[in-house]
């Protein structure tokens, strides 16, 4: 991982661990700079509820595997997931939902009503969002879980589907 | 640009480049803690679908021009949008549309479609937001578009349509 | 406040003020690297307008009281809140609000309309969001307000109605 | 039509306790939230405090805790608020008004009043 | 508690004048703010919400303005039917509370 805010350095991986003591260069390269995150577009075919993520997406000191995003350093972390649906009204509502996952847990959801009015109706965008502050363990995995994955628009908007996470404050 | 966490120095804008070596309040003072920022309310009066914002915003590292948030320092940035809409239902429904632009190039949108029943109502309040996060070079400009922008409601709600970008990890 | 990213030191409390001068284990413990956040949950029953919180939530470096956050290091935060509404629609429409509010005034405010249709439905949900990025004093309260505080969904998705808030950049 | 209608003026005893209603009619009772306004003779309004039907939840003005009690039946779209240990300040015309659903909206809807009168 | 400065307590105007009650809160109250007109021996009547919306039914002649703290309601064109007695209501806060009240006479 490579820490961003510290010039000179070529290593990538961060000093886990180890007492810097007076070694100011150590201590500074070691721990205030250090970053993790990751910025994933859905899978343009899903199949799951689980969704799935496009693996050339932006992510830097956490893994992707089937769905999850794990976790490499310990600390708080920002999730944030937004999601567009499409749905072809008929003459019942339907319930859109978007639930956070941590270790295969739900932590978070959102679940937001459309086509009340029963009325059949072309299409009816709508969009969630969800976020979460967690404390996470390495290789904690994060998801993502909807109950009507085909309403998950994919077609209209293959960007604008994304599960973000990122590092507020490291622990180790 | 100051660097809010770094005590006892004046200088104004950071280090770019160079080499500190072994000068480590070259290095303290040149990396860990730079920080760009900003929040910018939109302006009362619209009449484009690219949004204007009010230039007495809260900004920091970065510089407003004519719709525009220029990018001073290159890094990875979380860009947040929220908009407050109103809009008086017709015999028809109506797609709002929030769109967040990098060099004038659409990146993530959301739409939202409201009155889908197609009965008169006297006022239908909705509100959309979008999330970004993207690496940026120097002058890259960030914008918002919309496609209807005589319902982004600036008479009820001036403070609550708001851009806002602060720089998560800086790569210089 | 523990230093999350400060190695080998106990000390609990950021060194305030103060001239670091030449001394760089000083000027590296007392600054980069502070952190202040929050994540609370709804609390269960709810009778006011302003919203109470579960004293149980995660908080580090600010306080809960009363229904306030109040801050106890200044700087620029990020504040974010997130409520799920059910509504049972009868014949007239609902306005569903969410504030933010900085020392009880409203500085952001989120507004959207459910049963637009006047269609009897089962049960409406709907998820509202706010974030607001201001600069914040020491003693600052951030608190938040609903009109319709009945539709906040506390039995369903009690974990799922949350306020969250981090320090981005801090100015001591 | 929306319609408020509370029950009739009471005369009572120092010391006593009185319960007044306010029915609803014209609307969906649980959707909305119940308040309580006092009025003294030759004064201004005092809010007394407030219920919601659809959660069974009650505020109350520090003022009147301990002093009135709120309660509500969903079945007969009917509300109540008791008054006890009574005495002539207690002497009031109160009223029962429904706060509204949309953004901003005030005491749309206000019942005829019930007059208190604490007399020996 | 939110506190409601209502002024004048008492007013006396000709037909036709134009006239201004003022209520002042103790804090912002974010235009969470009423006026209702009381008839004697009658309910109050909702006439201005939101500081500045007309409810359905009153007259344009009644007008409400104002933001933060400070507020006022403005009569044009007083007609016989104005008199009474007109209270403005803060919604903003728990307690809610109310301005003490204006009387408005007709001369």
């Known amino acids: 991982q490579k820490k961003d805010s510290t010039p000179n350095t070529t290593e990538k991986a961060p000093l886990k661990g180890g007492n810097c003591s007076e070694d100011l260069f150590c201590t500074l390269k070691s721990t205030p700079s250090k970053k993790s995150w990751a910025y994933l577009q859905v899978s343009k075919h899903l199949n799951n509820t689980k969704l799935s993520w496009n693996e050339d997406g932006t992510i830097h000191g956490l893994i992707y595997q089937d769905g999850n995003l794990i976790v490499q350093f310990p600390g708080l972390y920002f999730i944030v997931c937004q999601l567009q649906f499409l749905v072809q009204c008929s003459n019942h509502s339907v319930d859109l939902t978007l639930q956070l996952l941590i270790n295969s847990k739900i932590k978070k959801q959102t679940l937001v009503t459309v086509c009340e009015s029963g009325v059949q109706s072309k299409n009816i965008y709508q969009n969630l969002s969800q976020f979460l502050l967690h404390y996470l363990q390495v290789n904690s995995t994060i998801s993502v879980r909807v109950d009507n994955f085909q309403y998950v628009d994919t077609n209209t908007f293959p960007l604008d589907n994304v599960l973000s996470v990122f590092l507020y404050s490291s622990s180790d | 640009q100051k660097k809010d966490s770094t005590p006892n120095t004046t200088e104004k804008a950071p280090l770019k480049g160079g080499n500190c070596s072994e000068d480590l309040f070259c290095t303290l003072k040149s990396t860990p803690s730079k920080k760009s920022w900003a929040y910018l309310q939109v302006s009362k009066h619209l009449n484009n679908t690219k949004l204007s914002w009010n230039e007495d915003g809260t900004i920091h590292g970065l510089i407003y021009q004519d719709g525009n948030l220029i990018v001073q320092f290159p890094g990875l940035y979380f860009i947040v949008c929220q908009l407050q809409f109103l809009v008086q239902c017709s015999n028809h429904s109506v797609d709002l549309t929030l769109q967040l632009l990098i060099n004038s190039k659409i990146k993530k949108q959301t739409l939202v479609t409201v009155c889908e029943s197609g009965v008169q109502s006297k006022n239908i309040y909705q509100n959309l937001s979008q999330f970004l996060l993207h690496y940026l070079q120097v002058n890259s400009t960030i914008s918002v578009r919309v496609d209807n922008f005589q319902y982004v409601d600036t008479n009820t709600f001036p403070l609550d349509n708001v851009l806002s970008v602060f720089l998560y990890s800086s790569s210089d | 406040q523990k230093k999350d990213s400060t190695p080998n030191t106990t000390e609990k409390a950021p060194l305030k003020g103060g001239n670091c001068s030449e001394d760089l284990f000083c000027t590296l413990k007392s600054t980069p690297s502070k952190k202040s956040w929050a994540y609370l949950q709804v609390s269960k029953h709810l009778n006011n307008t302003k919203l109470s919180w579960n004293e149980d939530g995660t908080i580090h470096g600010l306080i809960y009281q009363d229904g306030n956050l109040i801050v106890q290091f200044p700087g620029l935060y990020f504040i974010v809140c997130q409520l799920q509404f059910l509504v049972q629609c009868s014949n007239h429409s609902v306005d569903l609000t969410l504030q933010l509010l900085i020392n009880s005034k409203i500085k952001k405010q989120t507004l959207v309309t459910v049963c637009e249709s006047g269609v009897q439905s089962k049960n409406i949900y709907q998820n509202l969001s706010q974030f607001l990025l201001h600069y914040l004093q020491v003693n600052s309260t951030i608190s938040v307000r609903v009109d319709n505080f009945q539709y906040v969904d506390t039995n369903t998705f009690p974990l799922d109605n949350v306020l969250s808030v981090f320090l981005y950049s801090s100015s001591d | 039509e929306v319609k408020l209608q509370q029950s009739g003026d009471e005369l009572v005893r120092p010391g006593a306790s009185v319960k007044m209603s306010c029915k609803a009619s014209?609307?969906?009772?649980?959707?909305?939230?119940m308040h309580w306004v006092k009025q003294s003779p030759g004064q201004g309004l005092e809010w007394i405090g407030s219920?919601?039907?659809?959660?069974?939840?009650?505020s109350y003005n520090q003022k009147f805790k301990g002093k009135a009690t709120l309660t509500a039946d969903k079945s007969s779209n009917t509300a109540y608020m008791e008054l006890s240990r009574l005495t002539s300040e207690d002497s009031a015309v109160y009223y029962c008004?429904?706060?509204?659903?949309?953004?901003?909206?005030?005491?749309?809807?206000w019942g005829q009043g019930v007059m208190v009168t604490v007399s020996s | 508690d939110i506190q409601m400065t209502q002024s004048p307590s008492s007013m006396s105007a000709s037909l036709g004048d134009t006239v201004t009650i003022n209520c002042l809160a103790s804090?912002?109250?974010?235009?969470?703010l009423s006026w209702y007109q009381q008839k004697p021996g009658k309910s109050p009547k909702l006439m201005i919400y939101?500081?500045?919306n007309l409810e359905d039914g009153v007259p344009s002649r009644f007008s409400g303005s104002g933001s933060g703290s400070d507020y006022s309601l403005t009569i044009n064109s007083l007609g016989y039917d104005d008199e009474g007695i007109y209270h403005c209501?803060?919604?903003?806060?728990?307690?809610?509370?109310f301005g003490s009240g204006t009387k408005l006479e007709i001369k």
């Open positions: 939101g500081a500045t």
């Open positions: 209501h803060q919604y903003y806060e728990y307690p809610l509370t």
């Open positions: 014209g609307y969906t009772f649980t959707d909305y939230a």
């Open positions: 219920i919601i039907p659809l959660i069974d939840t009650t």
């Open positions: 008004a429904r706060l509204g659903s949309r953004y901003l909206e005030g005491f749309d809807y």
């Open positions: 804090q912002d109250i974010g235009n969470y």
